[in-house]
Interface confidence: low
């Protein structure tokens, strides 16, 4: 069973309850490379941060190239992807509980904004995929995720014809996508410049009250 | 091997339509997004606008109402026409094949066009 | 559209040189920032890409930077094949824009 994010109390400045998460967040000044942005305040290691960087990392032995080698242009999006996952501290209004034998807690329709997930349709144009849902359904027989039987490696553009198609099909719907755009304090950036803060703040501010808890 | 090629006519009179074929090869057009970037004699690059790999389009404002882009992608093929040339539209046109949706990472040799009567 | 302003518009380095080139852009840009050089009578080449990352088979020499929304370009030792022209390029939004240029010459 599921219950809402308002179940919980403490929405903001908040890490979930998953694999690899810290129980509570705070500096973290050896974030790294894409991940940097969240130094000052982080819901992942450094370790973490180091590990999440590689292909089939360790920590989900996930392989991105299981159509063949992505493009880094496309790649790059999916390692901030999961830097925004593993890092952000600002995602409470989105947790929701579930039963998994790896995490207790997941995000469902966090609002990314509109242009951050329409750069990442674009650049990953031209790498390939077999499945439209990358939560479920491969064969992990060798340890690593494989297409299954009868899934063909096509363009992302075929199993993903829209931006709203990859970045709410993809993760079973961690993410929706927003009408909003960046710099807007309406929509979470999975990109941002760590020098000017860190916008997410602002934007889990706003749906925590939205949702009237404090 | 990726490479693009512009082709089309040197020289155009004023107010005339310029039409230009960039041929690619080494990459399909059904995945990849195409854009063309011009640069007048000892100036810099500008934008004229991206045909996207699902067809669409993206025109640079300035020149949006006398430029269209278009493609065939069996023939690997993308199209630039432009309307009503002046003196100050001479340039080299280069095609562009995208990094991504955010820089250019292949480029044409580009094709020198001059207008003048 | 977001202006790119680049300098110095002209550059005089001697060989084994330290040189930096800088662009300014008119607002907040992210990452989203690449270097192209540019050979005389050749097409512009990608240098660097998301302000940071060498593009493949460009020599370890070039490397890029970023402090707020002024990014940099620095040659560590100037050899002559680095004699052109160099423009930024953002990446952020259409329609896509570069800067003025920077002509670098051998001194």
């Known amino acids: 069973t599921m219950c809402s994010a308002q179940d919980r109390t403490d929405l903001l400045n908040v890490c979930m309850d998953a694999k690899h998460h810290k129980t509570k967040p705070g500096p973290e000044d050896k974030l790294h490379d894409q991940c940097s942005p969240w130094k000052k305040n982080a819901c992942c290691t450094a370790s973490t941060s180091q590990e999440l960087h590689k292909d089939t990392s360790r920590l989900y032995n996930f392989n991105w190239d299981h159509c063949g080698k992505m493009e880094p242009a496309c790649k790059r999006h999916f390692i901030q992807d999961t830097c925004l996952y593993e890092c952000s501290p600002n995602l409470g209004p989105w947790i929701q509980q579930v039963n998994q034998s790896w995490r207790k807690e997941r995000f469902l329709d966090v609002p990314l904004c509109k242009e951050d997930c329409q750069r990442w349709w674009e650049d990953c144009h031209t790498s390939h995929t077999c499945k439209s849902n990358w939560h479920r359904g491969w064969d992990w027989t060798s340890g690593v995720n494989k297409c299954p039987a009868g899934a063909l490696c096509r363009t992302f553009e075929s199993y993903f014809p829209t931006p709203a198609a990859l970045c709410e099909g993809l993760w079973s719907h961690s993410y929706k996508v927003s009408n909003y755009s960046r710099g807007s304090g309406r929509c979470i950036q999975m990109w941002f410049d760590s020098a000017q803060g860190n916008p997410n703040e602002e934007v889990a501010r706003f749906y925590a009250a939205a949702m009237h808890v404090n | 091997q990726v490479q693009l090629k512009e082709s089309g006519p040197g020289l155009v009179q004023p107010s005339q339509t310029l039409s230009l074929t960039c041929t690619v090869s080494g990459f399909s057009l059904t995945s990849n997004s195409v854009s063309w970037v011009r640069q007048p004699p000892g100036k810099g690059l500008e934008w004229m606008g991206a045909?996207?790999?699902?067809?669409?389009?993206d025109y640079n404002s300035a020149l949006k109402s006398r430029l269209s882009i278009s493609k065939d992608t069996s023939k690997s093929q993308v199209f630039l026409k432009m309307n009503s040339l002046q003196t100050e539209d001479t340039a080299i046109y280069f095609c562009t094949r995208y990094y991504g949706y955010t820089y250019f990472a292949y480029w044409g040799q580009g094709v020198m066009v001059t207008v003048s009567s | 559209d977001i202006q790119m302003t680049q300098s110095p518009a002209s550059l005089s380095a001697s060989l084994e040189e330290i040189v930096t080139i800088t662009c300014q852009a008119s607002q907040d840009i992210g990452n989203w920032l690449a270097w192209y050089q540019q050979k005389p009578g050749k097409s512009p080449q990608l240098l660097i890409y998301?302000?940071?990352r060498l593009a493949d088979g460009v020599p370890s020499r070039f490397s890029g930077s970023r402090s707020g929304t002024q990014y940099s370009l620095k040659i560590s030792r100037l050899q002559v094949e680095d004699i052109g022209d160099y423009y930024c390029?953002?990446?952020?939004?259409?329609?896509?824009?570069f800067g003025g240029g920077t002509k670098l010459e051998l001194k």
């Open positions: 998301d302000a940071i």
């Open positions: 390029q953002q990446g952020q939004s259409n329609p896509r824009t």
């Open positions: 045909i996207w790999s699902g067809g669409s389009t």
